[in-house]
């Protein structure tokens, strides 16, 4: 089974690298998840993304969970997901009518 993820190995400033040129095919039977690192800096929000094995992503996200404080300077949030391109842009909230 092969999934695709968005990948940008170096931090991107205010660019969540969720456009087609960042799509990669993950290693079959090894990398079964997508991961994302979001860091909040004074210059703006920085993004890193890649494919990962489930073990690697879960070790990282569990080990650094306490560093995630959204809205706070130097916050670092790691997330893992296991569906194609799931580390892409957050779905926009639909307005209620």
């Amino acid at each position: 089974l092969q999934i695709q993820c968005y990948q940008c190995e170096e931090f991107q400033l205010n660019n969540d690298c969720s456009s087609p040129e960042f799509i990669v095919n993950c290693t079959v039977n090894v990398q079964d998840m997508c991961q994302k690192e979001v860091m909040e800096q004074s210059a703006g929000i920085m993004y890193r993304k890649s494919c990962a094995s489930s073990a690697a992503c879960l070790i990282a996200s569990a080990g650094y969970q306490s560093f995630c404080s959204p809205g706070k300077l130097n916050s670092v949030c790691i997330s893992c997901c296991n569906t194609p391109l799931c580390n892409g842009p957050r779905p926009k909230k639909r307005g209620s009518s």
């Epitope: 190995e9 170096e10 931090f11 993950c26 290693t27 090894v30 990398q31 991961q35 690192e37 860091m39 800096q41 004074s42 210059a43 920085m46 890193r48 890649s50 494919c51 990962a52 094995s53 073990a55 690697a56 070790i59 990282a60 080990g63 650094y64 560093f67 130097n74 670092v76 790691i78």
Partner: antibody, heavy 120, light 107 residues
């Protein structure tokens, strides 16, 4: 217990080649990046490069780009540093270390190092 | 590349002294900085990660602080086993460059 053991160092002539190994135990290398760091006699630490064994993705310092190649055999839980076109300035102790993908993660475990001497 | 400028390059101190080593990054690296201790003929050992977090098993006399571009390693009361060389390293972006090192010697 987590352990990294380097081997393969020795004396080699300028222009020659050498392959270093980094055998890991106590953890699975596919969950980490494996980094190579070197230290010339009496000098500081110099980052050489890294591999993510799960994808094979590598990155190299400019000083070794095009001459050194990092690879991994996940079935053996071992990473390698193939060094070609060696120069006198490559003489150093070579260490391997592990690091999670997360930017905040440090190199938490290191091998004991293996000495490479490039001399005629 | 992100450069790490470490100072001083060496210092002499006595047992019981408070020692401070600084590291300056050439750009904002948030808190993605680690500190290592190295003794002659040995591999580096991790002391501090994420700028201020003490690694498991490291004595509490070691502490780290800073964010952005300026970082500090402090040894609150120098012990005989602390005479060594100390390195900072940024892991914000490749290449993961180290500082030049600070050798702590006995006065």
């Amino acid at each position: 217990e987590v352990q990294l053991v380097e081997s393969g160092g020795g004396l080699v002539q300028p222009g020659g080649s050498l392959r270093l190994s980094c055998a890991a135990s106590g953890f699975t290398i596919t969950n980490y990046g494996i980094h190579w760091v070197r230290q010339a006699p009496g000098k500081g630490l110099e980052w050489v490069g890294r591999i993510y064994p799960d994808s094979g993705a590598t990155y190299y310092a400019d000083s070794v780009k095009g001459r050194f190649t990092i690879s991994a055999d996940t079935s053996k839980n071992t990473a390698y540093l193939q060094m070609n076109s060696l120069r006198a300035e490559d003489t150093a102790v070579y260490y391997c270390a592990r690091k999670l993908w997360v930017s905040l993660a440090p190199m938490d475990y290191w091998g004991q190092g293996t000495l490479v001497t490039v001399s005629s | 590349d992100i450069q790490m400028t470490q100072s001083p390059s060496s210092l002499s101190a006595s047992v019981g002294d408070r020692v401070t080593i600084t590291c300056r990054a050439s750009q904002d690296v948030s808190t993605a900085v680690a500190w290592y201790q190295q003794k002659p003929g040995k591999a580096p050992k991790l002391l501090i990660y994420s700028a201020s977090f003490l690694y498991s098993g490291v004595p509490s006399r070691f502490s780290g602080s800073g964010s952005g571009t300026d970082f500090t390693l402090t040894i609150s009361s120098l012990q005989p086993e602390d005479f060594a060389t100390y390195y900072c390293q940024q892991s914000y972006g490749t290449p993961f460059i180290f500082g030049q090192g600070t050798k702590v010697e006995i006065k």
